[in-house]
């Protein structure tokens, strides 16, 4: 039970004190007590309840004609039943004893009310009147904890405007209500209660600016809201009438958990009694609650897809046709933007990240935008974020971002158990140099802090930056599987293709062509690249850099060998010895569920099928997966891209309730 | 064959800043490596800067780190050198330099440390 | 002082043959085969003669010859023309933390 006031009672004269329901309330029965008197009996109206414990020793009576001493040790407290009808119409009644006096006498007249602030605490999607308790105070995480959530209004309703809804201090309709979490002040009092005492609603200064409080209005012909709380106002006087009431407020989130805020806003309700008008208005009774701002969760390649988004640029219908193709056969809508919106840059994957935020009464998808910033830069902002799509950014949004700040560097893993810790929504990855030196490329560390503060994904640091572009795609992706845990990694492996290179070759295949019908391009046979000592040495390279991640995610993610598949793959060292796919990078494939749509190859043709192909669909397939190989020579892979890094997908998000876990 | 021309010198003062640009033509400069250089009245030449064709990284010369950075536009076939807390000892002709970035190299052929292409450069002055 | 050391001069006469050292370390031209020479007239932008070491662009005529020997690299300039004047700079890929390094430059005179 919630801890009430202290009331000190003295004979001189009656005391009046407000009792909120559902408050223990301490009652000093012994500073005020008359010199010669040496204990105290209690008499109490019907409503009222009083406990008095003596200690020592610690044993408790309840009230009646019995005496007790008065002494330090006497602890007398008090609850009511019920809210008052009328001012001061309980009572309690303290008579002081003493050997050689008659009993003197102290009054002690109270008001019960019911003042309590609700919101979703059980995060069942609706809002249950509790009285002022202690647990609301607090916000657990796992299945048994309690606390209410709020979405960050980070989404656009209003199709006209150029701002998300929480930028402005409107609600625009009902649907921009449903973005909010309802929040209910509910008080019984008598009539004239609040002639002598006011309610004040208020939250922290250094919370203020991270949510927005509407009060909900009734007219008699809409359901007005009005701001009470928010980036300018940490406090707001409650006009409230006597009687019972409820009064109802929708709040909204305007920031996201981040470094210097772990997501948690506490909304509170004090009353204030003004009835001394020459004195300061004292505070009577708090009521808080305790919300966490939903976090932003990323979804891996596991997750059923609802959405591809391409672009359009100069010459790659055929590729368009491809992924369209391959979005149907998925049942996925898809999103092309057109070369007047992406200024030639077609780089989807690096722009932008597909998450969600979740609170039990709304889901919401919700577009992480990068700070890269190249061509596709008003892409997510104006194509993306709109009614019921959200939108969020972090990172410098001019200058100071390096390669690895694109999204084709952050992926997510599906959902892991390493030891005995359950990551039931998965790892975030993301690529970084192997140690700081005065030309390394990490991601910024304003997206490191942003990705680690949501908490439910906890990041995983990769080594990328010895890739030419620097991205984690480069080499790994995730697809789905039906048995063991559920997916297979994939990793680009030069042993592997030396291996069924070496052995084509042993079966008399060596002046098979790589590159064939790839216009202006040299093609090399299996012979030459196997007898190639510097593109051995290379790929000897590019295999301890994989093989350091490899060992990072089988310790990261719990794997074993068994759920690691490696898809042949070669490399090369170009400029300040940073590598790049040698031939298309299969492993940067586009997984839509069961359809894979992975970059063509063109490697050797023997017996009339791409020995490449041939290998990636004998290793993939007996997964129940169905590989389609896009050709995305001239107009991705030359451009140091594939076909992942080229589309971008929004999936379903996880039916698990991130609440539900504990981080 | 691409052709470069720099531009955005000029005089100015210590603790100043200038961007010089580099504007190519007869080619696409996203094919292409491209390096500042930079050379100081009767002196030798520096290597100042570079950016990859695939604008996915950059290096500095430990003369300039952390004041210069470098940058490109694709869609305006052009490459910058952004300059702050500028010196004295800046004071030089700023030459834009590139190398085409062949996807046909089996290994590496060392385009980004050589530079085939030049410009005519563009003097800048660094005084009170 | 340049990273890389070159004599400040050398010459000879016309038809002749010179030889222009560039002295580098283990970590830049002894490490690499990225060293390549630029010829400089006065008031003009460089000129690539020599890259990879030994390899000439297109239009360099084959009086140019590059070579390298531990952490020395050499240019060599056969049967000597007048238009050959001018200052030349070697260069290398460099594992230091200025990944390419450039040499103060040595002015040959044809005499």
């Known amino acids: 039970m919630a801890q009430g006031t202290l009331i000190r009672v003295t004979p001189e004269q009656p005391t009046h004190a407000v009792c909120v329901l559902g408050t223990l309330t301490q009652l000093d029965v012994c500073s005020s007590a008359p010199e010669d008197c040496t204990s105290f009996s209690v008499n109490t109206s019907p409503g009222v309840v009083v406990d008095i414990a003596h200690s020592p020793p610690a044993k408790k009576k309840s009230t009646g004609s019995s005496t007790w001493p008065l002494d330090p040790g006497v602890e007398v407290t008090l609850t009511m039943k019920a809210a008052s009808g009328s001012t001061g119409d309980q009572k309690v009644q303290i008579s002081y004893h003493g050997p050689k006096t008659p009993p003197v006498k102290a009054l002690l007249y109270l008001t019960g009310v019911e003042i309590s602030l609700s919101a979703d605490i059980t995060r069942t999607g609706k809002v249950k009147p509790t009285r002022a308790v202690e647990d609301k105070r607090t916000w657990t995480w796992g299945p048994c904890g309690q606390g209410a959530i709020l979405l960050v209004n980070c989404d656009r309703d209003n199709p006209e405007s150029s701002a998300m809804d929480c930028e402005d201090d409107e609600v625009l309709d009902s649907k921009d209500l449903k973005d909010m979490s309802l929040m209910t002040l509910s008080t019984k009092t008598p009539q004239d209660f609040f002639t002598r005492h006011t309610l004040v609603l208020h939250v922290a200064r250094s919370e203020m600016d991270k949510v927005r409080v509407f009060q909900a209005t009734r007219g008699r012909l809409s359901s007005r809201c009005r701001v009470v709380l928010g980036p300018k106002q940490p406090s707001h006087y409650l006009m409230v009438p006597g009687g019972k009431h409820n009064m109802d407020f929708y709040v909204e989130a305007l920031a996201f958990p981040d470094t210097n805020f772990p997501g948690l806003i506490t909304l509170t309700v004090s009353m204030l009694d003004t009835s001394k008008l020459e004195l300061p208005e004292a505070v009577v009774f708090q009521d808080s609650v305790v919300f966490r701002v939903a976090p932003w969760i990323m979804t891996p390649n596991t997750q059923p897809p609802q959405e591809v988004y391409v672009c359009s640029i100069f010459e790659n219908e055929d590729f368009l046709k491809s992924v369209t193709a391959l979005a149907m056969q998925a049942r996925c809508k898809l999103t092309i933007c057109p070369e007047e919106e992406n200024m030639d840059d077609q780089w989807m994957q690096d722009e932008m990240e597909i998450g969600y935020i979740q609170a039990p009464h709304k889901t919401l998808p919700v577009v992480f935008d990068s700070p890269r910033n190249r061509g596709l830069k008003e892409f997510p902002i104006k194509r993306v974020m709109g009614p019921d799509f959200g939108y969020v950014t972090r990172g410098p949004q001019t200058g100071g971002v390096s390669g690895l700040d694109s999204f084709g560097n952050l992926e997510v893993s599906p959902p892991v158990t390493v030891g005995d810790k359950e990551y039931p929504l998965g790892r975030i990855l993301f690529g970084d140099s192997c140690y700081p030196s005065s030309d390394s490329r990490e991601m910024h560390q304003a997206l490191q802090d942003f990705l680690s503060a949501q908490q439910v994904q906890a990041p995983v640091k990769l080594y990328s930056d010895w890739l030419t572009v620097g991205h984690v795609d480069e080499f790994l992706s995730f697809v789905p599987a039906p048995d063991r845990k559920g997916f297979r990694l994939l990793l680009a492996s030069p042993r592997s293709c030396y291996k069924l290179f070496q052995e084509q070759q042993n079966e008399g295949h060596g002046d098979a062509l790589l590159f064939q019908g790839i216009k202006k391009k040299n093609q090399q046979k299996i012979k030459n690249i196997l007898s190639n000592t510097t593109l051995r040495e290379h790929n000897s390279f590019v295999e301890r850099c994989i093989d350091w991640n490899r060992e990072l995610l089988k310790r990261e993610l719990g794997l074993a060998e068994s759920d690691i598949i490696d898809i042949p793959q070669l490399f090369k060292l170009k400029e300040f010895s940073k590598a790049e796919a040698f031939f298309p990078n299969m492993v940067n494939m586009l997984v839509l569920g069961k359809h894979l749509g992975i970059p063509k190859p063109f490697g050797p043709i023997i017996n009339g099928r791409c020995c490449l192909e041939e290998k990636v669909c004998s290793l993939l397939e007996p997964l129940g997966l169905h590989c389609t190989f896009i050709n995305d020579f001239y107009t991705y892979h030359i451009r140091h891209g594939e076909v992942h890094c080229g589309t971008n997908v929004r999936r379903k998000p996880f039916s698990f309730k991130w609440w539900n876990m504990v981080p | 064959q691409v052709q470069l021309v720099e531009s955005g010198g000029g005089l100015v003062k210590p603790g100043g800043s200038l961007r010089l640009s580099c504007a190519a033509s007869g080619s696409t400069l996203s094919d292409y490596f491209v390096s500042w250089i930079r050379q100081a009245p009767g002196k030798g030449l520096e290597w100042v800067s570079f950016i990859n064709a695939a604008n996915t990284f950059t290096y500095y010369a430990d003369s300039v780190r952390g004041r210069f950075t470098i940058s490109r536009d694709n869609a305006k076939n052009s490459v910058y050198l952004q300059m702050n807390s500028l010196r004295a000892e800046d004071t030089a002709v700023y030459y834009c330099s590139s190398a085409n970035d062949d996807v046909d190299d089996i290994v590496a052929p060392g385009r980004g440390y050589y530079m085939d292409v030049w410009g005519r450069g563009t003097l800048v002055t660094v005084s009170s | 002082q340049s990273a890389l050391t070159q004599p400040r001069s050398v010459s000879g006469s016309p038809g002749q043959s010179v030889t222009i050292s560039c002295t580098g370390t283990?970590?830049?031209?002894?490490?690499?085969?990225?060293v390549s020479w630029y010829q400089q007239h006065p008031g003009k932008a460089p000129k690539l003669i020599i890259y990879?070491?030994?390899e000439r662009p297109s239009g360099v005529p084959d009086r140019f010859s590059g070579s390298k020997s531990g952490n020395t690299a050499s240019l060599t300039i056969s049967g000597l023309q007048a238009e050959d004047e001018a200052d030349y700079y070697c260069?290398?890929?460099?594992?230091?933390?200025?990944?390419?390094?450039f040499g103060g430059g040595t002015k040959l005179t044809v005499l």
């Open positions: 990879n070491v030994y």
């Open positions: 260069s290398s890929h460099s594992r230091s933390s200025t990944p390419v390094l």
């Open positions: 283990s970590g830049d031209v002894g490490r690499y085969s990225h």
